[in-house]
Structure formats: C-alpha cells, structure tokens
Amino acid sequence: APVPPGEDSKDVAAPHRQPLTSSERIDKQIRYILDGISALRKETCNKSNMCESSKEALAENNLNLPKMAEKDGCFQSGFNEETCLVKIITGLLEFEVYLEYLQNRFESSEEQARAVQMSTKVLIQFLQKKAKNLDAITTPDPTTNASLLTKLQAQNQWLQDMTTHLILRSFKEFLQSSLRALRQM
C-alpha cells in the first residue's frame, strides 16, 4: 500500500515547510485516495476487458452511484460552499458501502483496496470538521446498505467485474470534482 499522506519522501526532504493547512491536508488526502484508485483500476483493467466494454451503460443503470449535479452547488455556476460540502460528505458516506464491496475483489492489490477504504473514512472526518451544517448530512441506512451489499455479491462474475470497474471509475470522478470544489472554499 502507498505511504499515507504526510509521510511521503517530499515531506521528509522539506523539513522547513510550513505545516499543512486544513485545506491542503484534505487536498493531500484526496490525492492519496486517487493514487490508490489508479492502482486498483490498473489491476481491474489488466484482469478483464471491462475498461473497454460497451455494455457498461446497462450495468451503470442498476447502480445508484453518487454523482455531482448542477444543483449540488459544486460547479462554478451556482457555486454554494455549504450545499457543496454537504453533497461531498453525503456522497462519500454513500460510497462507503461500495468501497466495502471492493474489499474482496482484488488479489494483488488487497492492501491497496483497504487503504482506499480507510483513507476515505479519514477524509470524511476531515470534511465533517469543516462543515457548519452537519444536520443536513444524511447518513445511509445500515439495513439498506447490508441488503445492497448482499445483492452486489450475489451477481454473476461478469456483473461483479463490471460493478468493480464502475465503482472505481465513478469514485475517481466524484473525488476529482470534489477536489476542484474544495479548493474554492
């Protein structure tokens, strides 16, 4: 697994650097998760042809993966810091069940999958400290998540491979959009 943020060689080589601000720490945490996703996607794409499949749209419709929309206030037009932050935290909480699903989906990158899951939990904690309106954040229902996980794990092999690919791709896109929005806050 990659070295967690704040412990990389760049930081060691630059001991006189000012301590990271809260925004920079969040930025670094997201980059770390994105690096982990890249490694997992590499294994997925090498193992199956899902990354080139034209049938992904069919499978995507059956997954309710979080996405950024204009109404979420994270894009330049209609940017709203509080609404956007709530969307990012809510979206990450919704992704947690899908990250749990990924845990048994990798052979050579098992540690990496765990690192992505754990780093996401840390990221959520960072963001919750930043949020003023925690009441607006809806936490997914554990019972619903448990049945979703069972349903996903009961899919045939092809659908499980496709689901893995789609989760990683959507999570990457969600994090990239979040990163841009958070920099404006």
Epitope: F75, R169, R180, R183
Partner: antibody
Framework: QVQLQQWGAGLLKPSETLSLTCAVY????????WSWIRQPPGKGLEWIGE???????NYNPSLKSRVTISVDTSKNQFSLKLRSVTAADTAVYYC??????????WGQGTMVTVSS | DIQMTQSPSSLSASVGDRVTITCRAS??????LAWYQQKPEKAPKSLIY???SLQSGVPSRFSGSGSGTDFTLTISSLQPEDFATYYC?????????FGQGTKVEIK
C-alpha cells in the same frame, strides 16, 4: 500516449462565429476537464472555459456571454463556439486537458484571425 | 478574479546561470500553482504543479517553491534549451488565470 488534435476555420470576418473542435486520442476521455485557452499574438495566455465529460461547464466570466463549449463523448471530442467575434479575438486557440493540478496535455494550437 | 503577476517580464542570462522567476497572486492560493514553459510557435509545456512538484520527464534543474501568495521558479543551471517564456497559473478558483509571462533570453 494521450494526444489532442484540433481543427477549425482560421479566418473569420467580424460578427461571425468561431468554431473549433478538439479530438482526444489514445487515452481516457472520462474523468478529466477539457479546456480551451487562447493566446493573442505576442501576448499571454487566457483561459476561456472547460467542460467535464458529463457536460458540466465552467466559463471565464469575461467571455461567458459569447462562449459555448460542448462535448461529444461518443467521438471523444469537445468543441468551442465563440459568437460575434471582433479583431480582439484574433489569437492562437489551444485545447488542453486539465488534470487535478495543471494543463498537462495540449493541442497543437489553431491560429484564428478576425479581419474584414 | 485572482490576478497573477510575474517578475521580471524578461531577463537575459548565460548558459550555466542560476535563474529565478517570481509569481505573486492577488490573494492566497495555498500551493495550487503550476509553471509552464513555452517556446516560439509551440504549445506550453507543464513543468511544475502544486507549487513544487516536478512533472515527470522534467529535468531536476527546475524547481518551484512558495505557498500562499508568493512563488518562485528556479533554474539551477541554465541550459541552451531553457531559453523560452515561462508562465505561472493558479488553479485555486475560477476563472483559471495565468501570469503575463517571463521571457528568458540569451545574454
């Protein structure tokens, strides 16, 4: 190796619409923001706007009223339209990919001249 | 909009010289700054991102530093291929904005 190839009309008359297209070859189109940047002769760089593969756009407020950026994911292409051009729009127009940090891949540039 | 101001606007130097270009943002941009090199009739090329991280394939004689509003690009030992125009760019907020450029010429 991701490459961007751009094309479009190079000579326009005032009040016409500038139209350029950029195609992405050899890499993923999804998950990136795709930008247009211009550079008037002998001057610096000006960001025009960008589009995400999903169609979400961000524009430079100084040009927003005249600009439309669109995407065709089936062809891995994105396009720029700039309405009601004047001589001040004469520039080299570049398409570029914005990764999470910078414009890491650029098109070859298209010189657009506006003259009556 | 965040204004980016580079200095100097041009400089003359010799091969082997140490060259420093500065970039100032009109408001704090954390470390969300990139540096580009542009040669005549060519598209800009990314050198540094996140204020101090070197793009892969860029020679180690290039380095960046700074945070907040003040940033520096340093070329430790100028090479013939380094004569070009250099731009800084912020990506903290929209619209993305560039410095006006610094032209590095042969003395």
């Amino acid at each position: 190796q991701v490459q961007l190839q751009q094309w479009g009309a190079g000579l326009l008359k005032p009040s016409e619409t500038l139209s350029l297209t950029c195609a992405v070859y050899g890499g993923s189109f999804r998950g990136y923001y795709w930008s247009w940047i211009r550079q008037p002769p002998g001057k610096g760089l000006e960001w025009i706007g960008e589009i995400f593969h999903s169609g979400s756009t961000n524009y430079n407020p100084s040009l927003k009223s005249r600009v439309t950026i669109s995407v065709d994911t089936s062809k891995n292409q994105f396009s720029l339209k700039l309405r009601s051009v004047t001589a001040a729009d004469t520039a080299v127009y570049y398409c570029a990919r914005e990764d999470i940090d910078d414009f890491d891949i650029w098109g070859q540039g298209t010189m657009v001249t506006v003259s009556s | 909009d965040i204004q980016m101001t580079q200095s100097p606007s041009s400089l003359s130097a010799s091969v082997g010289d140490r060259v420093t270009i500065t970039c100032r943002a009109s408001q704090g941009i954390s470390s969300w700054l990139a540096w580009y090199q542009q040669k005549p009739e060519k598209a800009p090329k990314s050198l540094i991102y996140a204020a101090s991280s070197l793009q892969s394939g860029v020679p180690s004689r290039f380095s960046g530093s700074g945070s907040g509003t003040d940033f520096t690009l340093t070329i430790s030992s100028l090479q013939p291929e380094d004569f070009a125009t250099y731009y800084c760019q912020q990506y903290k907020s929209y619209p993305r904005t560039f410095g006006q450029g610094t032209k590095v010429e042969i003395k």
